[in-house]
Protein backbone atom coordinates (compact mmCIF):
# COMPACT_ATOMS: atom_id res chain seq x y z
CA UNK A 1 0.00 0.00 0.00
CA UNK A 2 1.42 3.36 -1.04
CA UNK A 3 1.30 6.23 1.48
CA UNK A 4 -0.90 9.21 0.66
CA UNK A 5 1.34 12.24 0.12
CA UNK A 6 0.72 15.56 -1.61
CA UNK A 7 2.03 15.91 -5.16
CA UNK A 8 5.06 18.23 -5.32
CA UNK A 9 4.55 21.52 -7.12
CA UNK A 10 4.83 21.22 -10.92
CA UNK A 11 4.76 17.43 -10.91
CA UNK A 12 1.04 16.85 -11.46
CA UNK A 13 0.68 14.64 -14.55
CA UNK A 14 -1.41 16.29 -17.29
CA UNK A 15 -1.03 13.22 -19.46
CA UNK A 16 0.57 9.79 -19.34
CA UNK A 17 3.95 10.49 -20.92
CA UNK A 18 7.64 9.66 -20.72
CA UNK A 19 8.29 12.13 -17.93
CA UNK A 20 6.67 9.62 -15.54
CA UNK A 21 9.48 7.16 -16.02
CA UNK A 22 11.54 8.54 -13.15
CA UNK A 23 8.67 9.27 -10.80
CA UNK A 24 9.13 7.46 -7.53
CA UNK A 25 6.34 5.23 -6.22
CA UNK A 26 4.89 7.92 -3.97
CA UNK A 27 5.08 10.53 -6.76
CA UNK A 28 3.14 8.31 -9.16
CA UNK A 29 0.54 7.70 -6.45
CA UNK A 30 0.21 11.40 -5.63
CA UNK A 31 0.59 12.95 -9.07
CA UNK A 32 -1.22 10.64 -11.52
CA UNK A 33 -4.99 10.85 -11.65
CA UNK A 34 -6.62 7.41 -11.94
CA UNK A 35 -9.23 8.60 -14.43
CA UNK A 36 -6.49 10.06 -16.64
CA UNK A 37 -4.60 6.77 -16.42
CA UNK A 38 -7.70 4.79 -17.43
CA UNK A 39 -8.29 6.92 -20.52
CA UNK A 40 -4.63 6.78 -21.59
CA UNK A 41 -3.80 3.15 -20.86
CA UNK A 42 -2.46 2.66 -24.38
CA UNK A 43 0.34 5.10 -23.54
CA UNK A 44 1.42 3.03 -20.54
CA UNK A 45 2.41 0.28 -22.96
CA UNK A 46 4.86 2.60 -24.71
CA UNK A 47 6.79 3.50 -21.55
CA UNK A 48 9.35 1.05 -20.07
CA UNK A 49 7.99 1.07 -16.53
CA UNK A 50 9.46 -1.02 -13.74
CA UNK A 51 7.38 -3.51 -11.76
CA UNK A 52 7.41 -1.15 -8.80
CA UNK A 53 5.81 1.54 -10.96
CA UNK A 54 3.33 -0.90 -12.51
CA UNK A 55 2.24 -1.90 -8.99
CA UNK A 56 1.32 1.72 -8.27
CA UNK A 57 -0.58 2.07 -11.56
CA UNK A 58 -2.50 -1.13 -10.80
CA UNK A 59 -3.34 0.16 -7.33
CA UNK A 60 -4.79 3.34 -8.88
CA UNK A 61 -6.93 1.36 -11.34
CA UNK A 62 -8.13 -0.92 -8.51
CA UNK A 63 -9.31 2.11 -6.55
CA UNK A 64 -11.07 3.57 -9.59
CA UNK A 65 -12.73 0.27 -10.56
CA UNK A 66 -13.33 -1.77 -7.38
CA UNK A 67 -15.94 -3.89 -9.19
CA UNK A 68 -13.55 -4.78 -12.01
CA UNK A 69 -11.98 -2.97 -14.98
CA UNK A 70 -14.01 -2.08 -18.08
CA UNK A 71 -12.95 -3.78 -21.31
CA UNK A 72 -11.61 -0.49 -22.71
CA UNK A 73 -8.97 -0.58 -19.95
CA UNK A 74 -8.39 -4.35 -20.04
CA UNK A 75 -7.55 -4.31 -23.75
CA UNK A 76 -4.66 -1.90 -23.12
CA UNK A 77 -3.22 -3.45 -19.95
CA UNK A 78 -0.11 -4.73 -21.72
CA UNK A 79 2.51 -5.87 -19.20
CA UNK A 80 0.28 -4.66 -16.39
CA UNK A 81 -1.61 -7.92 -17.00
CA UNK A 82 1.35 -9.78 -15.46
CA UNK A 83 0.54 -8.01 -12.16
CA UNK A 84 -3.10 -9.18 -12.08
CA UNK A 85 -4.30 -11.98 -9.83
CA UNK A 86 -7.02 -14.52 -10.73
CA UNK A 87 -9.22 -12.70 -8.19
CA UNK A 88 -8.81 -9.45 -10.15
CA UNK A 89 -9.62 -11.19 -13.43
CA UNK A 90 -12.77 -12.85 -12.08
CA UNK A 91 -14.29 -9.37 -11.81
CA UNK A 92 -13.83 -8.73 -15.54
CA UNK A 93 -16.29 -9.16 -18.37
CA UNK A 94 -14.19 -9.85 -21.47
CA UNK A 95 -16.09 -10.28 -24.75
CA UNK A 96 -13.72 -9.04 -27.47
CA UNK A 97 -11.40 -11.52 -29.15
CA UNK A 98 -8.96 -8.64 -29.72
CA UNK A 99 -8.77 -8.11 -25.95
CA UNK A 100 -8.08 -11.80 -25.40
CA UNK A 101 -5.36 -11.82 -28.08
CA UNK A 102 -3.71 -8.71 -26.65
CA UNK A 103 -3.45 -10.25 -23.19
CA UNK A 104 -2.36 -13.69 -24.40
CA UNK A 105 0.38 -11.98 -26.43
CA UNK A 106 1.74 -10.39 -23.24
CA UNK A 107 1.71 -13.77 -21.52
CA UNK A 108 2.95 -15.88 -24.43
CA UNK A 109 6.28 -16.90 -22.89
CA UNK A 110 4.56 -18.43 -19.86
CA UNK A 111 2.96 -21.80 -19.50
CA UNK A 112 -0.75 -21.38 -18.93
CA UNK A 113 -0.82 -19.48 -15.64
CA UNK A 114 -3.78 -19.33 -13.25
CA UNK A 115 -4.31 -15.76 -14.53
CA UNK A 116 -4.59 -16.91 -18.15
CA UNK A 117 -6.82 -19.86 -17.23
CA UNK A 118 -9.13 -17.46 -15.40
CA UNK A 119 -9.07 -15.00 -18.30
CA UNK A 120 -10.03 -17.73 -20.79
CA UNK A 121 -12.79 -18.93 -18.49
CA UNK A 122 -14.17 -15.37 -18.17
CA UNK A 123 -13.95 -14.90 -21.93
CA UNK A 124 -15.76 -18.13 -22.79
CA UNK A 125 -18.45 -17.37 -20.20
CA UNK A 126 -18.78 -13.83 -21.55
CA UNK A 127 -19.22 -15.11 -25.11
CA UNK A 128 -21.60 -17.84 -24.08
CA UNK A 129 -19.93 -20.43 -26.33
CA UNK A 130 -16.56 -21.72 -27.47
CA UNK A 131 -16.64 -20.70 -31.13
CA UNK A 132 -14.11 -21.55 -33.82
CA UNK A 133 -12.41 -18.14 -33.75
CA UNK A 134 -11.86 -18.45 -30.02
CA UNK A 135 -10.50 -21.99 -30.31
CA UNK A 136 -8.25 -20.95 -33.16
CA UNK A 137 -6.82 -18.20 -30.97
CA UNK A 138 -6.44 -20.38 -27.89
CA UNK A 139 -4.81 -23.30 -29.70
CA UNK A 140 -2.41 -20.91 -31.45
CA UNK A 141 -1.20 -19.59 -28.09
CA UNK A 142 -1.68 -22.77 -26.04
CA UNK A 143 -1.90 -25.94 -28.14
CA UNK A 144 -2.03 -27.90 -24.86
CA UNK A 145 -5.32 -26.18 -24.15
CA UNK A 146 -7.02 -28.81 -26.29
CA UNK A 147 -6.59 -31.46 -23.61
CA UNK A 148 -8.39 -29.32 -21.07
CA UNK A 149 -11.56 -29.32 -23.18
CA UNK A 150 -14.36 -31.86 -23.02
CA UNK A 151 -14.98 -34.10 -26.09
CA UNK A 152 -18.11 -32.03 -26.73
CA UNK A 153 -16.12 -28.80 -26.76
CA UNK A 154 -13.43 -30.40 -28.92
CA UNK A 155 -15.98 -31.26 -31.59
CA UNK A 156 -15.97 -27.60 -32.70
CA UNK A 157 -12.17 -27.40 -33.08
CA UNK A 158 -11.34 -26.57 -36.70
CA UNK A 159 -8.91 -29.05 -38.33
CA UNK A 160 -6.65 -26.09 -39.23
CA UNK A 161 -5.91 -25.61 -35.50
CA UNK A 162 -4.38 -29.09 -35.38
CA UNK A 163 -1.30 -27.85 -37.26
CA UNK A 164 -0.18 -25.89 -34.21
CA UNK A 165 -0.27 -28.95 -31.92
CA UNK A 166 3.06 -30.38 -30.72
CA UNK A 167 3.31 -34.02 -29.56
CA UNK A 168 3.87 -32.99 -25.93
CA UNK A 169 0.67 -30.94 -26.01
CA UNK A 170 -1.35 -34.16 -26.23
CA UNK A 171 0.34 -35.83 -23.25
CA UNK A 172 -2.59 -35.08 -20.95
CA UNK A 173 -5.33 -36.00 -23.44
CA UNK A 174 -7.39 -39.06 -22.56
CA UNK A 175 -8.69 -41.60 -25.15
CA UNK A 176 -12.09 -39.88 -25.39
CA UNK A 177 -10.40 -36.64 -26.40
CA UNK A 178 -8.11 -38.37 -28.91
CA UNK A 179 -11.17 -40.08 -30.44
CA UNK A 180 -12.40 -36.58 -31.35
CA UNK A 181 -9.03 -35.12 -32.33
CA UNK A 182 -7.77 -38.00 -34.50
CA UNK A 183 -10.29 -37.59 -37.37
CA UNK A 184 -9.53 -33.85 -37.40
CA UNK A 185 -5.80 -34.53 -37.59
CA UNK A 186 -6.37 -37.08 -40.36
CA UNK A 187 -8.26 -34.43 -42.31
CA UNK A 188 -5.70 -31.71 -41.59
CA UNK A 189 -2.74 -33.81 -42.76
CA UNK A 190 -4.45 -35.72 -45.59
CA UNK A 191 -2.41 -34.09 -48.37
CA UNK A 192 0.98 -35.04 -46.92
CA UNK A 193 3.05 -37.93 -48.25
CA UNK A 194 3.43 -41.20 -46.31
CA UNK A 195 6.45 -40.60 -44.07
CA UNK A 196 5.64 -36.92 -43.42
CA UNK A 197 2.02 -37.84 -42.72
CA UNK A 198 3.06 -40.44 -40.15
CA UNK A 199 5.33 -37.98 -38.31
CA UNK A 200 2.41 -35.54 -37.96
CA UNK A 201 -0.36 -38.06 -37.21
CA UNK A 202 1.70 -40.19 -34.79
CA UNK A 203 0.79 -38.31 -31.61
CA UNK A 204 -2.94 -38.50 -32.46
CA UNK A 205 -3.01 -42.27 -33.09
CA UNK A 206 -4.51 -42.97 -29.65
CA UNK A 207 -7.80 -42.18 -31.39
CA UNK A 208 -7.22 -44.26 -34.54
CA UNK A 209 -9.59 -47.11 -35.51
CA UNK A 210 -8.41 -50.59 -36.60
CA UNK A 211 -8.80 -49.95 -40.33
CA UNK A 212 -6.44 -46.96 -40.18
CA UNK A 213 -3.85 -48.98 -38.25
CA UNK A 214 -4.13 -51.73 -40.89
CA UNK A 215 -3.57 -49.12 -43.60
CA UNK A 216 -0.51 -47.75 -41.79
CA UNK A 217 0.92 -51.26 -41.50
CA UNK A 218 1.20 -51.32 -45.30
CA UNK A 219 3.33 -48.15 -45.37
CA UNK A 220 6.60 -49.17 -43.63
CA UNK A 221 6.09 -46.59 -40.88
CA UNK A 222 8.14 -48.32 -38.13
CA UNK A 223 5.95 -47.17 -35.25
CA UNK A 224 7.80 -46.98 -31.94
CA UNK A 225 6.61 -48.94 -28.90
CA UNK A 226 5.69 -45.80 -26.94
CA UNK A 227 3.18 -44.88 -29.66
CA UNK A 228 1.91 -48.47 -29.95
CA UNK A 229 1.28 -48.64 -26.20
CA UNK A 230 -0.99 -45.57 -26.45
CA UNK A 231 -3.23 -47.08 -29.14
CA UNK A 232 -6.82 -47.99 -28.31
CA UNK A 233 -6.98 -51.60 -27.12
CA UNK A 234 -10.14 -52.23 -29.17
CA UNK A 235 -8.31 -50.95 -32.28
CA UNK A 236 -5.26 -53.19 -31.72
CA UNK A 237 -7.06 -56.46 -30.90
CA UNK A 238 -8.21 -57.24 -34.48
CA UNK A 239 -4.71 -56.74 -35.94
CA UNK A 240 -2.97 -59.89 -37.12
CA UNK A 241 0.57 -60.80 -36.09
CA UNK A 242 1.75 -59.98 -39.60
CA UNK A 243 0.10 -56.55 -39.47
CA UNK A 244 1.64 -55.71 -36.08
CA UNK A 245 5.03 -56.86 -37.37
CA UNK A 246 4.72 -54.56 -40.39
CA UNK A 247 3.41 -51.69 -38.27
CA UNK A 248 6.29 -51.83 -35.79
CA UNK A 249 9.06 -52.83 -38.21
CA UNK A 250 12.36 -53.12 -36.29
CA UNK A 251 10.58 -52.03 -33.09
CA UNK A 252 8.64 -55.30 -32.98
CA UNK A 253 11.28 -56.72 -30.61
CA UNK A 254 10.00 -54.32 -27.97
CA UNK A 255 6.79 -56.33 -27.64
CA UNK A 256 8.56 -58.80 -25.35
CA UNK A 257 9.24 -56.13 -22.72
CA UNK A 258 5.61 -55.01 -22.84
CA UNK A 259 3.89 -58.44 -22.98
CA UNK A 260 2.29 -57.98 -19.54
CA UNK A 261 0.90 -54.53 -20.30
CA UNK A 262 -2.13 -53.39 -22.25
CA UNK A 263 -2.74 -53.34 -25.16
CA UNK A 264 0.04 -55.92 -25.88
CA UNK A 265 -1.20 -58.35 -23.21
CA UNK A 266 -4.77 -58.33 -24.53
CA UNK A 267 -3.59 -58.57 -28.15
CA UNK A 268 -1.41 -61.62 -27.36
CA UNK A 269 -4.43 -63.38 -25.81
CA UNK A 270 -6.26 -62.97 -29.14
CA UNK A 271 -3.49 -64.38 -31.37
CA UNK A 272 -2.72 -67.98 -32.26
CA UNK A 273 0.40 -69.14 -30.47
CA UNK A 274 1.73 -70.50 -33.78
CA UNK A 275 1.53 -66.99 -35.27
CA UNK A 276 3.19 -65.41 -32.23
CA UNK A 277 6.02 -67.96 -32.46
CA UNK A 278 6.86 -66.72 -35.98
CA UNK A 279 8.07 -63.47 -34.38
CA UNK A 280 10.77 -65.39 -32.50
CA UNK A 281 10.36 -63.20 -29.41
CA UNK A 282 9.19 -65.89 -26.99
CA UNK A 283 5.78 -64.28 -26.53
CA UNK A 284 3.51 -66.59 -24.52
CA UNK A 285 -0.21 -66.65 -23.83
CA UNK A 286 -1.63 -67.05 -27.32
CA UNK A 287 -4.41 -69.42 -28.32
CA UNK A 288 -3.07 -73.00 -28.34
CA UNK A 289 -3.05 -74.86 -31.65
CA UNK A 290 -6.27 -76.68 -32.44
CA UNK A 291 -8.47 -74.40 -30.35
CA UNK A 292 -11.47 -72.67 -31.91
CA UNK A 293 -12.07 -68.99 -31.16
CA UNK A 294 -15.66 -67.93 -30.71
CA UNK A 295 -16.44 -64.23 -30.84
CA UNK A 296 -19.21 -64.09 -28.22
CA UNK A 297 -19.99 -60.47 -28.89
CA UNK A 298 -20.76 -61.34 -32.51
CA UNK A 299 -22.90 -64.33 -31.40
CA UNK A 300 -24.95 -62.08 -29.10
CA UNK A 301 -25.48 -59.57 -31.85
CA UNK A 302 -26.80 -62.27 -34.21
CA UNK A 303 -29.21 -63.67 -31.60
Amino acid sequence: EVEKTACPSGKKAREIDESLIFYKKWELEACVDAALLATQMDRVNAIPFTYEQLDVLKHKLDELYPQGYPESVIQHLGYLFLKMSPEDIRKWNVTSLETLKALLEVNKGHEMSPQVATLIDRFVKGRGQLDKDTLDTLTAFYPGYLCSLSPEELSSVPPSSIWAVRPQDLDTCDPRQLDVLYPKARLAFQNMNGSEYFVKIQSFLGGAPTEDLKALSQQNVSMDLATFMKLRTDAVLPLTVAEVQKLLGPHVEGLKAEERHRPVRDWILRQRQDDLDTLGLGLQGGIPNGYLVLDLSMQEALS
Epitope: E18, S19, I21, F22, V44, N45, A46, I47, P48, F49, T50, Y51, E52, Q53, D55, G78, Y79, L82, G109, H110
Partner: antibody, heavy 119, light 106 residues
Framework: QVQLVESGGGLVKPGGSLRLSCAAS????????MSWIRQAPGKGLEWVSY????????YYADSVKGRFTISRDNAKNSLYLQMNSLRAEDTAVYYC????????????WGQGTLVTVSS | IQLTQSPSSLSASVGDRVTITCRAS??????LAWYQQKPGKAPKLLIY???SLESGVPSRFSGSGSGTDFTLTISSLQPEDFATYYC?????????FGGGTKVEIK
Protein backbone atom coordinates in the same frame (compact mmCIF):
# COMPACT_ATOMS: atom_id res chain seq x y z
CA GLN B 1 14.93 -7.75 -38.86
CA VAL B 2 16.01 -5.47 -36.01
CA GLN B 3 19.56 -4.17 -36.29
CA LEU B 4 21.59 -1.84 -34.09
CA VAL B 5 25.08 -0.98 -35.31
CA GLU B 6 27.49 1.01 -33.13
CA SER B 7 30.46 2.97 -34.42
CA GLY B 8 32.91 5.64 -33.25
CA GLY B 9 34.94 3.64 -30.77
CA GLY B 10 38.72 3.73 -30.66
CA LEU B 11 41.82 4.62 -28.68
CA VAL B 12 41.80 7.97 -26.88
CA LYS B 13 44.03 9.59 -24.28
CA PRO B 14 42.75 10.35 -20.76
CA GLY B 15 40.89 13.68 -20.79
CA GLY B 16 40.03 13.23 -24.47
CA SER B 17 36.65 12.95 -26.22
CA LEU B 18 34.81 10.52 -28.46
CA ARG B 19 31.39 10.43 -30.05
CA LEU B 20 29.66 7.08 -30.41
CA SER B 21 26.86 6.50 -32.90
CA CYS B 22 24.24 3.77 -33.16
CA ALA B 23 22.36 3.26 -36.44
CA ALA B 24 18.98 1.55 -36.02
CA SER B 25 16.93 -0.34 -38.61
CA UNK B 26 14.15 -2.90 -38.81
CA UNK B 27 11.84 -1.23 -36.26
CA UNK B 28 10.15 2.11 -35.62
CA UNK B 29 13.06 3.79 -33.87
CA UNK B 30 11.04 6.82 -32.73
CA UNK B 31 8.73 4.57 -30.68
CA UNK B 32 11.51 3.18 -28.50
CA UNK B 33 13.44 4.35 -25.48
CA MET B 34 17.15 3.76 -26.08
CA SER B 35 20.13 3.08 -23.81
CA TRP B 36 23.89 2.84 -23.74
CA ILE B 37 25.29 -0.03 -21.67
CA ARG B 38 28.98 -0.74 -21.22
CA GLN B 39 31.13 -3.71 -20.34
CA ALA B 40 34.67 -3.18 -19.04
CA PRO B 41 37.18 -5.93 -20.01
CA GLY B 42 36.42 -9.09 -18.03
CA LYS B 43 33.63 -7.33 -16.10
CA GLY B 44 29.84 -7.31 -16.02
CA LEU B 45 27.32 -5.01 -17.67
CA GLU B 46 26.70 -1.42 -16.48
CA TRP B 47 23.77 0.74 -17.55
CA VAL B 48 25.30 4.09 -18.56
CA SER B 49 22.58 6.26 -20.04
CA TYR B 50 19.04 6.31 -21.30
CA UNK B 51 16.88 8.55 -23.48
CA UNK B 52 13.12 8.53 -23.98
CA UNK B 53 11.50 8.14 -27.39
CA UNK B 54 11.12 11.89 -27.95
CA UNK B 55 14.44 12.71 -26.32
CA UNK B 56 12.91 14.81 -23.55
CA UNK B 57 13.69 12.46 -20.64
CA UNK B 58 17.29 11.45 -19.99
CA TYR B 59 19.16 9.43 -17.36
CA TYR B 60 22.88 9.06 -16.59
CA ALA B 61 24.68 6.73 -14.19
CA ASP B 62 26.52 8.61 -11.45
CA SER B 63 29.83 7.40 -12.87
CA VAL B 64 29.37 9.39 -16.11
CA LYS B 65 27.12 12.27 -15.01
CA GLY B 66 28.45 15.65 -16.23
CA ARG B 67 30.86 14.03 -18.70
CA PHE B 68 28.65 12.06 -21.10
CA THR B 69 25.72 13.35 -23.18
CA ILE B 70 23.14 11.10 -24.81
CA SER B 71 21.07 12.32 -27.77
CA ARG B 72 19.03 10.95 -30.64
CA ASP B 73 17.91 11.95 -34.13
CA ASN B 74 14.64 10.18 -34.92
CA ALA B 75 14.70 11.41 -38.50
CA LYS B 76 18.02 9.61 -39.01
CA ASN B 77 17.17 6.59 -36.81
CA SER B 78 20.31 7.29 -34.83
CA LEU B 79 21.42 7.35 -31.20
CA TYR B 80 24.56 9.13 -29.99
CA LEU B 81 26.80 9.27 -26.94
CA GLN B 82 29.17 12.22 -26.62
CA MET B 83 31.92 11.25 -24.17
CA ASN B 84 34.13 13.99 -22.73
CA SER B 85 36.84 14.04 -20.02
CA LEU B 86 37.44 10.34 -20.58
CA ARG B 87 39.15 8.27 -17.88
CA ALA B 88 40.94 4.94 -17.90
CA GLU B 89 37.95 3.38 -16.10
CA ASP B 90 35.71 4.30 -19.07
CA THR B 91 37.55 1.67 -21.13
CA ALA B 92 34.85 -0.79 -22.20
CA VAL B 93 32.77 -2.18 -25.01
CA TYR B 94 29.78 0.17 -25.40
CA TYR B 95 26.47 -1.32 -26.52
CA CYS B 96 23.40 0.51 -27.68
CA UNK B 97 20.13 -1.23 -26.76
CA UNK B 98 16.43 -0.62 -27.14
CA UNK B 99 14.18 -0.83 -24.10
CA UNK B 100 11.07 -2.95 -24.45
CA UNK B 101 7.84 -1.02 -24.88
CA UNK B 102 5.93 -1.21 -21.60
CA UNK B 103 8.62 -2.91 -19.53
CA UNK B 104 12.11 -1.90 -18.39
CA UNK B 105 13.99 -4.66 -20.24
CA UNK B 106 16.71 -4.43 -22.86
CA UNK B 107 15.10 -6.05 -25.87
CA UNK B 108 17.56 -5.61 -28.74
CA TRP B 109 21.30 -4.96 -28.56
CA GLY B 110 24.00 -3.93 -30.99
CA GLN B 111 27.31 -5.78 -31.35
CA GLY B 112 29.18 -3.10 -29.41
CA THR B 113 32.09 -0.74 -30.10
CA LEU B 114 35.33 -0.77 -28.08
CA VAL B 115 36.51 2.42 -26.39
CA THR B 116 40.06 2.31 -24.98
CA VAL B 117 41.25 5.17 -22.79
CA SER B 118 45.00 4.98 -22.36
CA SER B 119 48.03 7.21 -22.50
CA ILE C 1 19.46 -2.90 -6.03
CA GLN C 2 22.49 -5.18 -6.17
CA LEU C 3 22.39 -8.57 -7.89
CA THR C 4 24.83 -11.32 -6.97
CA GLN C 5 25.24 -14.26 -9.34
CA SER C 6 26.72 -17.60 -8.42
CA PRO C 7 28.80 -19.33 -9.42
CA SER C 8 30.91 -16.83 -11.36
CA SER C 9 31.94 -19.67 -13.66
CA LEU C 10 31.24 -23.36 -14.09
CA SER C 11 32.40 -26.22 -16.29
CA ALA C 12 29.88 -28.62 -17.74
CA SER C 13 29.44 -31.18 -20.49
CA VAL C 14 26.93 -31.37 -23.32
CA GLY C 15 23.73 -32.93 -21.95
CA ASP C 16 24.33 -31.74 -18.39
CA ARG C 17 21.68 -29.94 -16.35
CA VAL C 18 23.02 -26.53 -15.39
CA THR C 19 21.69 -24.20 -12.69
CA ILE C 20 22.71 -20.56 -12.16
CA THR C 21 21.44 -18.44 -9.27
CA CYS C 22 20.89 -14.73 -8.89
CA ARG C 23 20.25 -13.10 -5.51
CA ALA C 24 18.83 -9.58 -5.11
CA SER C 25 19.82 -7.30 -2.22
CA UNK C 26 16.10 -6.63 -1.62
CA UNK C 27 12.79 -8.09 -2.77
CA UNK C 28 12.06 -7.50 -6.47
CA UNK C 29 8.87 -9.54 -6.90
CA UNK C 30 9.33 -11.43 -10.21
CA UNK C 31 11.02 -8.50 -11.95
CA LEU C 32 14.04 -10.40 -13.16
CA ALA C 33 15.38 -11.05 -16.65
CA TRP C 34 18.15 -13.35 -17.90
CA TYR C 35 20.46 -12.63 -20.85
CA GLN C 36 22.90 -14.82 -22.75
CA GLN C 37 26.13 -13.39 -24.16
CA LYS C 38 28.51 -15.27 -26.43
CA PRO C 39 32.11 -14.03 -26.88
CA GLY C 40 32.25 -10.99 -29.16
CA LYS C 41 28.46 -10.93 -29.51
CA ALA C 42 25.65 -8.80 -28.15
CA PRO C 43 23.68 -10.04 -25.12
CA LYS C 44 20.35 -11.69 -25.96
CA LEU C 45 17.21 -11.63 -23.82
CA LEU C 46 16.22 -15.17 -22.78
CA ILE C 47 13.74 -14.84 -19.93
CA TYR C 48 11.72 -12.05 -18.30
CA UNK C 49 9.26 -11.91 -15.42
CA UNK C 50 11.51 -14.51 -13.74
CA UNK C 51 10.06 -17.43 -15.74
CA SER C 52 8.65 -16.17 -19.04
CA LEU C 53 10.54 -17.39 -22.08
CA GLU C 54 11.23 -14.77 -24.76
CA SER C 55 9.98 -15.76 -28.24
CA GLY C 56 12.33 -18.09 -30.09
CA VAL C 57 14.24 -19.21 -26.99
CA PRO C 58 14.53 -23.04 -26.73
CA SER C 59 12.39 -24.68 -24.05
CA ARG C 60 15.46 -26.24 -22.39
CA PHE C 61 15.91 -22.82 -20.77
CA SER C 62 13.71 -22.12 -17.77
CA GLY C 63 13.63 -19.58 -14.99
CA SER C 64 12.14 -19.62 -11.51
CA GLY C 65 12.06 -17.65 -8.29
CA SER C 66 10.47 -14.61 -6.70
CA GLY C 67 11.46 -12.02 -4.13
CA THR C 68 15.23 -12.25 -3.68
CA ASP C 69 16.26 -15.67 -5.00
CA PHE C 70 16.14 -16.64 -8.67
CA THR C 71 17.37 -19.52 -10.81
CA LEU C 72 18.16 -20.05 -14.48
CA THR C 73 18.19 -23.71 -15.50
CA ILE C 74 19.37 -25.29 -18.74
CA SER C 75 17.85 -28.78 -18.67
CA SER C 76 20.24 -30.36 -21.19
CA LEU C 77 23.23 -28.25 -22.15
CA GLN C 78 23.84 -27.93 -25.90
CA PRO C 79 27.09 -26.86 -27.63
CA GLU C 80 25.60 -23.46 -28.49
CA ASP C 81 24.76 -22.77 -24.81
CA PHE C 82 28.38 -22.24 -23.75
CA ALA C 83 28.30 -18.51 -22.98
CA THR C 84 28.07 -15.98 -20.16
CA TYR C 85 24.68 -15.45 -18.51
CA TYR C 86 23.57 -12.24 -16.79
CA CYS C 87 20.55 -11.46 -14.64
CA UNK C 88 18.93 -7.98 -14.64
CA UNK C 89 16.33 -6.54 -12.29
CA UNK C 90 13.58 -4.31 -13.62
CA UNK C 91 11.77 -3.75 -10.34
CA UNK C 92 13.06 -0.19 -9.93
CA UNK C 93 15.35 2.36 -11.55
CA UNK C 94 18.29 2.41 -11.93
CA UNK C 95 18.28 -0.94 -13.72
CA UNK C 96 21.10 -3.21 -12.57
CA PHE C 97 22.82 -6.39 -13.74
CA GLY C 98 24.42 -9.33 -11.97
CA GLY C 99 28.14 -9.95 -12.38
CA GLY C 100 27.64 -12.81 -14.83
CA THR C 101 28.18 -16.58 -14.87
CA LYS C 102 30.46 -18.08 -17.49
CA VAL C 103 29.46 -21.58 -18.62
CA GLU C 104 32.50 -23.36 -20.05
CA ILE C 105 33.07 -26.74 -21.68
CA LYS C 106 34.43 -29.35 -19.26
Amino acid sequence: QVQLVESGGGLVKPGGSLRLSCAASGFTFSDYYMSWIRQAPGKGLEWVSYISSSGSTIYYADSVKGRFTISRDNAKNSLYLQMNSLRAEDTAVYYCASLQRGLALFQHWGQGTLVTVSS
Amino acid sequence: IQLTQSPSSLSASVGDRVTITCRASQGISSALAWYQQKPGKAPKLLIYDASSLESGVPSRFSGSGSGTDFTLTISSLQPEDFATYYCQQFNSYPLTFGGGTKVEIK
